[in-house]
Interface confidence: low
């Protein structure tokens, strides 16, 4: 509450997060022309990345393009990309949607379609939909521990969200345990009125707001965090503005002295921890 | 504008960026003692890294040290590093400029020069200039989509920079399209009065400032972002303070059961998105 | 100092860090059943990661799990995890402490102990203590250069912590050189009243606070940074809340067409650079 007599100061904050959980992923794997069901286990080293404290990312879905090599190949025949003759293909042209630089030749993509040849990582990435349901949909049951250290330098006051009295096996609940700083990812979405299973397909950004309203006067001292959750990406976003949250990264390797890569388009939830508030003192 | 009667509140912000573009790189490649011209294509997975929302990095240049292995070898003969006898070399010494730990022996680096032997990743990195012009100079034509979600918690007000009416094929222009949030990298530099081609060689840091001056009173509501650009690194910086922007990273692999690495010194532009402003309400 | 007649404005900041130093690591290496002492050199590409400007990480210790492959194996026999019959093992169960999903079978871990079989990256990570002393304890002698560019947009004022007059071979000292922005990591810990050697074992978070108290009036202009240091993680934290600072990451590779990984549990110091302050002008 606003106490006009107080000297207010914004919070200086540092955050540390730790995600826990294992996902079992079942997907079709093609090897040597044979497709079979593959099971794999993803742990934290597989689905999360060492990011800054105030943000963490959990991969919930992916599309892989394996064994790419730098060469010439037909580009992917997405809408409007097919050709019937070389006239349609412009040497040196880089279509922002494409994944390579055109050579100027129109070549067969498969038995029925022709596309412009490109210099690229080949075969080029297929523009297929993200798998539905999401491959790591069980990430809903992962938990994240959030440690937040705050400082009001002008008041020379420091505290943190985890107190010695807290129980390390607790789970945050708005009513029953509002001070517990271990959060189940599915609960965060539920609190924000969002459907984890749905968002996991394309990815998204979820805000975890930590609000510190601190009264630092000795006679009415109060300084504990309040947690709230809201979705930060626009779920109604137009296709052209890249809805959801994804990024591409590559694993490079050599085979028979040829540099190759596996391209992974990773969809997932980026959690942004937004710490704000003020410390007031007479 | 300052309305003294209003209750002002700082902005809470979350940013998501998406870079698009392909670069064709031509460089001399030496294999088996033969040097020839090599062409390669770089896409987003090759030149950018999954960083936090409020920063993104675009590699514009690089120097590679391939096939390094942990062993003993002569250090690079940079200015002041040559020796004529073992007396010049101190066992256990780590020169901050060097890349290894001296063994105490002075050994031939090539036919004409001797340097102190070091325990290091060998052969040690050559201290050569960054290629000029920059290898990925065409990154000037890459574009970045910036999505910014803001919140004034005290006023319980949320908005974003991308409106449903926006056109996904727009490009930001200060005069013609100041609300478009797709930016051509070259334009950002031009707006900041900087030369992309020049900065791309050594790298640099570019600030994209998003200023929200929001009047949240219903009778004169206004809340849209203003974009401005300024260079954040010091272009006149003394050599000793590491001008430009670069970092080293490694790709590790095994060959004949020996761990090896390719060391990449990546030069590039780090773009920092600095969101600030206030929301005022009577 | 508070000048009530001044219009105060918070600082907008951008940070760039550069770590320098080499560590020699000696550890027991087992190959083909034979254990011998291995020496290796770690340079910046090995112990640090390209993070955002306002944070950097220096690995000071690690535990490796080499040659893991996705299969079935007994889980690690940590306290409470042993079994004597299949009844103790629940098919499909994921213990948050475990690294896999139980198959329902109780199998021998070694000659004396049995544990539940799991589907996981195998062999599962041994839950052993972080090496003591820390493997990269010599990181105490690494240095970090911190470049900080600040801006008060309302006052249209920009400056930075590195001035042209500064000496690039200086080292920060609270009394003798308080404006030098090259910091020895060990000195940062000493200033904060912490023991680097101790913290390096389990890792931790260290805050480097840069306080700008700027008087921008022309007649009494002053705008230089003040550096201070404080530990941000809780050294007295209960085991259940994950004391110290570590994260796991993996290096993936293929061997005989089987995907394998080396899992690294990296302990280290995350340095958070917290920039704050105000610019005041009449």
């Amino acid at each position: 509450s606003d106490k006009l007599y107080q000297r207010k100061e914004p919070v200086i904050s540092s955050v540390h997060t730790k995600v826990k959980g294992i996902a079992e992923v079942t997907e079709n794997v093609t090897e040597g022309g044979v497709t079979k069901l593959g099971h794999s286990i993803f742990d934290t080293a597989d689905y999360t990345f060492p990011l800054q404290g105030n943000s963490f990312f959990v991969m919930t879905n992916y599309v892989k393009s394996e064994g790419q090599v730098q060469t010439l190949c037909p580009e992917y025949p997405r809408r409007g990309a097919q050709c019937s003759s070389d006239r349609r293909c412009k040497k040196g042209w880089m279509d922002p949607q494409s994944k390579g630089i055109q050579t100027g030749r129109c070549v067969p993509y498969d038995k029925t379609r022709k596309t412009c040849e490109v210099s690229a990582w080949c075969p080029t990435e297929e523009e297929k939909e993200a798998p539905r349901p999401a491959l790591l949909r069980s990430a809903e049951n992962f938990t994240v521990l959030i440690k937040n250290n705050i400082h009001f330098p002008g008041h020379n006051y420091t505290t943190r969200n985890i107190l010695p009295t807290m129980n390390g096996s607790c789970t945050f609940h708005k009513t029953w345990d509002p001070q517990c700083s271990i959060f189940r990812l599915g609960d965060i979405f539920q609190e924000a009125g969002e459907n984890f299973t749905e968002v996991a397909v394309q990815g998204g950004i979820m805000g975890i707001e930590i609000y510190w309203d601190c009264n630092l006067d000795s006679w009415s001292h109060h300084c504990r965090p309040r947690y709230s959750f809201r979705r930060l990406d626009d779920k109604n976003m137009d296709e052209s503005f890249v809805p959801g949250y994804n990024f591409r990264y590559a694993k490079y390797y050599k085979e028979n002295n040829v540099e190759k890569r596996t391209l992974i388009k990773a969809f997932g939830i980026r959690f942004d921890i937004l710490v704000f508030g003020t410390g007031g003192k007479f | 504008s300052d309305k003294l009667y209003q209750r002002k509140e700082p902005v809470i912000s979350s940013v998501h960026t998406k870079v698009k573009g392909i670069a064709e790189v031509t460089e001399n490649v030496t294999e088996g003692g033969v040097t020839k011209l090599g062409h390669s294509i770089f896409d987003t997975a090759d030149y950018t890294f999954p960083l936090q929302g409020n920063s993104f990095f675009v590699m514009t240049n690089y120097v590679k040290s391939e096939g390094q292995v942990q062993t003993l070898c002569p250090e690079y003969p940079r200015r002041g590093a040559q020796c004529s006898s073992d007396r010049r070399c101190k066992k256990g010494w780590m020169d901050p400029q060097s890349k290894g730990i001296q063994t105490g022996r002075c050994v031939p680096y090539d036919k004409t020069r001797k340097t102190c032997e070091v325990s290091a990743w060998c052969p040690t990195e050559e201290e050569k200039e960054a290629p000029r012009p920059a290898l990925l100079r065409s990154a000037e034509n890459f574009t970045v989509l910036i999505k910014n979600n803001i919140h004034f918690p005290g006023h319980n007000y949320t908005t974003r920079n991308i409106l449903p009416t926006m056109n996904g094929s727009c490009t930001f222009h200060k005069t013609w399209d100041p609300q478009c949030s797709i930016f051509r990298l070259g334009d950002i530099f031009q707006e900041a009065g900087e030369n992309f081609t020049e900065v791309a060689v050594q790298g640099g840091i570019m600030g994209i400032e998003i200023y929200w001056d929001c009047n949240l009173d219903s009778w004169s509501h206004h809340c849209r972002p203003r974009y401005s650009f300024r260079r954040l690194d010091d272009k006149n910086m003394d050599e000793s303070f590491v001008p430009g922007y670069n970092f080293r990273y490694a790709k590790y692999y095994k060959e004949n059961n020996v761990e090896k690495r390719t060391l990449i010194k990546a030069f590039g532009i780090r773009f920092d998105i600095l969101v600030f402003g206030t929301g005022g309400k009577f | 100092s508070d000048k009530l007649y001044q219009r105060k404005e918070p600082v907008i900041s951008s940070v760039h860090t550069k770590v320098k130093g080499i560590a020699e690591v000696t550890e027991n290496v087992t190959e083909g059943g034979v254990t011998k002492l291995g020496h290796s050199i770690f340079d910046t590409a090995d112990y640090t990661f390209p993070l955002q400007g306002n944070s950097f990480f220096v690995m000071t210790n690690y535990v490796k799990s080499e040659g893991q492959v996705q299969t079935l194996c007994p889980e690690y026999p940590r306290r409470g995890a042993q079994c004597s019959s299949d009844r103790r093992c629940k098919k499909g169960w994921m213990d948050p402490q475990s690294k896999g999903i139980q198959t329902g079978r109780c199998v021998p871990y070694d000659k004396t102990r049995k544990t539940c079989e799991v589907s996981a990256w195998c062999p599962t990570e041994e839950e052993k203590e972080a090496p003591r002393p820390a493997l990269l304890r010599s990181a105490e002698n690494f240095t970090v250069l911190i470049k900080n560019n600040i801006h008060f947009p309302g006052h249209n004022y920009t400056t930075r912590n590195i001035l042209p007059t500064m000496n690039g071979s200086c080292t920060f000292h609270k009394t003798w050189d308080p404006q030098c922005s090259i910091f020895r990591l060990g000195d940062i810990f000493q200033e904060a009243g912490e023991n680097f050697t101790e913290v390096a074992v389990q890792g931790g978070i260290m805050g480097i606070e840069i306080y700008w108290d700027c008087n921008l009036d022309s007649w009494s202009h002053h705008c230089r940074p003040r550096y201070s240091f404080r530990r941000l993680d809780d050294k007295n934290m209960d085991e259940s809340f994950v004391p110290g600072y570590n994260f796991r990451y993996a290096k993936y590779y293929k061997e005989n067409n089987v995907e394998k990984r080396t899992l690294i549990k990296a302990f280290g110091i995350r340095f958070d650079i917290l920039v704050f302050g105000t610019g005041g002008k009449f």
Epitope: - | - | A81, C83, R113
Partner: nanobody, 123 residues
Framework: EVQLVESGGGLVQAGGSLRVSCAAS???????MGWFRQAPGKEREFVST????????VYADSVKGRFTISRDNAKDTVYLQMNSLKPEDTAVYYC?????????????????WGQGTQVTVSS
């Protein structure tokens, strides 16, 4: 199904001693065994545990140096010798068995529980 039966509880003066026993209805030689206690109005808490072969023992800080746990696998019985008893040791003492051979202080690691025996320490 293993049944555990505690005995030996009772009333004792502060500073006195007591030995409680726990007999199993089936072979428990490969089990780890433990003692827990619950004072009126409080949660059940760990007291002590012993591994299958008696090599590993663990004690709660509050009883260290005063209580001793032991076992006789031939008789499938576990004992808790309590010396220098204090009024705060007053509680119902439960014997617990775990099919794991390893020692554990966690209640949920124990599959089998006795009905409990009352120990009262008067001042």
């Amino acid at each position: 199904e293993v049944q555990l039966v505690e005995s030996g509880g009772g009333l004792v003066q502060a500073g006195g001693s007591l030995r409680v026993s726990c007999a199993a209805s089936a072979r428990t030689g490969s089990y780890s065994m433990g003692w827990f206690r619950q004072a009126p109005g409080k949660e059940r808490e760990f007291v002590s545990t012993i591994s299958w072969n008696g090599a590993d023992t663990v004690y709660a800080d509050s009883v260290k140096g005063r209580f001793t746990i032991s076992r006789d696998n031939a008789k499938d019985t576990v004992y808790l010798q309590m010396n220098s008893l204090k009024p705060e040791d007053t509680a119902v003492y439960y014997c617990a068995g775990s099919i794991t051979s390893y020692v554990s202080t966690w209640q949920h690691d124990y599959e089998y529980w006795g009905q409990g025996t009352q120990v009262t320490v008067s001042s």
